[in-house]
């Protein structure tokens, strides 16, 4: 079970000048730190819009800022928890577009951002503060994802800022893409933090975290470095959840999605949540990447259902994941 | 199990609107978009919509825009469709069917069936 | 809306012979097909789902293949329970259409 940890806040150190330069030399290693969490490490953003004209009608917007091409999105209505959901549409950089009702008109606004418009007629369209889910593959970085909401209370014609939650499925392509400038940086900082090892420890207590403030969680190369860079979630407004005798976790996940935090939006997806998750026969978790496998045909190794998505054009391993799986 | 088990046969009048019921069993009701399929005498099948039961979000057949209005009861694990200005054109039987939610793809249940009969 | 054309529209056969339904779509639906088997007076029954899969607990008799644009049902040696009407369905994108079905009889 991973544990979760807060990166805490520095109190200031007494007045003076050997406060002053502990502080300056202190704050470095928390800095590279954070470099350490965050180099690399790409985002997505997603903005959700209420039209002025049609009150039903939403406009999401969601961009990748990462430096690898893209080779899918996917943008989904989010589920419990952020897991499932059900897919509106998907974009192809090459081989087009594809979406379900209510989705009306999804397209590329540049190379790295995409629009869709949903339509609605009171019925038909979802609560308002209802979650939408942008979900990037891109080569090196791997998969990133994404979720937001309207607030609560937003008026029509306005719209939620942009949301940016480098979260949360990264495939071992993007991890061992940053590893090499993690471990430069990361090893930089170990000697910095040797150095200061005889000095006295300044005050320290863990930051008050709102449950609102944006989080973000970049998964750690190794199980080693995960213990000393842990980062908080990413929060995002959950969708609104019907009152319901549903009380099973979704897609047979593992014990410990049951301890994850009410206001996580998304089921991790890194190496671990991948190794302890079980792929029944039909599978019911099976990530949409993993439909990213060639025309040829061939299935993945599992029968899980899943949309037969555009076959990638790295070859037919191109997609595969930490299990082997497709 | 899963069962989704329909209301049974109506007869209605021209102009009148009916609604039919679709309840589930033996799974995550809010895990899978529930479709509704139209067959009418010796024909096909015909797609109307979706909904999915976690937010209550539908998506429709755009022939089926002004005919249809689908929602859900999470508590009672029930899917609704609403048919409104019935005509004889109606007359068909109307199924709901399970489909996998994130995956978009094939119905892997169906209900039995509720027969509409549209006649003055 | 993709269009699905499905042939032929009725099949007489023996028990015991070898058939193959078709369907073609008007655009590439990659392997976003299931095809379905009605019979009289029941709901349709899934037989195959991503254009080749077997869904569970359909006999190995009956196979899907194709992508694309082409796709075919095939059923070896018919039996007797195999009588009924067959249907496509395409799932990529909405609206979902079905092809118009074909019916087989025993002859």
């Known amino acids: 079970m991973r544990t979760e940890a807060q990166v805490p806040a520095l109190q200031p150190p007494e007045p003076g000048l050997e406060g002053a330069m502990g502080h300056r030399t202190l704050v470095l290693p928390w800095v590279l730190l954070t470099l350490c969490v965050t180099a690399g490490t790409p985002e997505v953003w997603v903005q959700v819009r209420m039209e002025a004209t049609e009150l039903s009608s939403f406009t999401i917007r969601c961009g990748f800022l990462g430096s690898g091409s893209i080779s899918l999105v996917t943008v989904s209505w989010g589920g419990p928890n952020g897991a499932g959901g059900t897919t509106l549409a998907v974009l192809h950089p090459e081989r087009g577009i594809r979406q379900w009702a209510p989705a009306r008109q999804a397209r590329w606004e540049t190379q790295s951002s995409i629009s869709l418009i949903l339509e609605g007629s009171g019925a038909s369209s979802p609560c308002a503060n209802t979650t939408f889910c942008c979900k990037f593959a891109s080569f090196p970085e791997g998969s990133w994802e994404a979720c937001g909401s309207l607030p609560p209370s937003s008026d029509p014609g306005l719209s939620a800022p942009p949301t940016p939650a480098p979260i949360l499925r990264a495939d071992l392509a993007g991890i061992l893409g940053v590893s090499g400038v993690l471990l430069f940086g990361c090893v930089y900082l170990l000697h910095l933090l040797r150095r200061h090892k005889h000095r006295p420890a300044p005050r320290l207590q863990p930051s008050r975290t709102s449950p609102q403030a944006p989080r973000a969680r970049a998964w750690a190369p190794s199980q080693a470095s995960q213990a000393a860079l842990h980062v908080p979630y990413a929060t995002i407004n959950t969708s609104c959840r019907p009152a319901t005798l549903d009380t099973a976790h979704p897609h047979g996940g593992p014990s410990w999605w049951a301890s994850l935090p009410t206001h996580a939006a998304h089921r991790p997806q890194g190496p671990a949540a991948w190794a302890s998750t079980p792929i029944p026969a039909r599978g019911s978790f099976v990530s949409v990447e993993n439909g990213l496998y060639a025309q040829a045909g061939e299935r993945p190794p599992h029968t899980g259902p899943g949309l037969t998505l555009f076959p990638d054009p790295r070859g037919p391993r191109a997609m595969e994941g930490p299990l082997g799986v497709r | 199990e899963v069962q989704l088990q329909q209301s049974g046969p109506e007869l209605v009048r021209p102009g009148a609107s009916v609604r039919i019921s679709c309840k589930a069993s033996g799974y995550t009701f809010t895990d899978y978009n529930m479709n509704w399929v139209k067959q009418s005498h010796g024909k096909s099948l015909e797609w109307i919509g979706y909904?999915?039961?976690?937010?209550?979000?539908?998506g429709y057949n755009q022939n089926f825009k002004n005919k249809a209005t689908l929602t859900v009861d999470t508590y009672s694990r029930a899917a609704y469709m609403e048919l409104r200005s019935l005509t004889s054109e109606d007359s068909a039987v109307y199924y709901c069917?399970?489909?996998?939610?994130?995956?978009?793809?094939?119905?892997?249940?169906w209900g039995q069936g509720t027969i509409l009969t549209v006649s003055s | 809306d993709i269009q699905m054309t499905q042939s032929p529209a009725s099949l007489s056969v023996s028990v015991g012979e070898t058939v193959t339904i078709t369907c073609r779509t008007s655009e590439n639906i990659y392997s976003n097909l299931a095809w379905y088997q009605q019979k009289q007076g029941k709901s349709p029954q899934l037989l195959v789902y991503?254009?080749?899969n077997l869904a569970d607990g359909v006999p190995s008799r009956f196979s899907g293949s194709g992508s694309g644009t082409q796709f075919s049902l095939k059923i070896n040696s018919l039996q007797s329970g195999d009588f009924g009407s067959y249907f496509c369905?395409?799932?990529?994108?909405?609206?979902?259409?079905f092809g118009g079905g074909t019916k087989l009889e025993i002859k």
């Open positions: 909904i999915y039961p976690y937010n209550g979000g539908a």
């Open positions: 991503a254009a080749t």
């Open positions: 369905q395409h799932f990529w994108g909405t609206p979902y259409t």
């Open positions: 069917a399970r489909e996998r939610g994130m995956q978009r793809d094939y119905f892997d249940y």
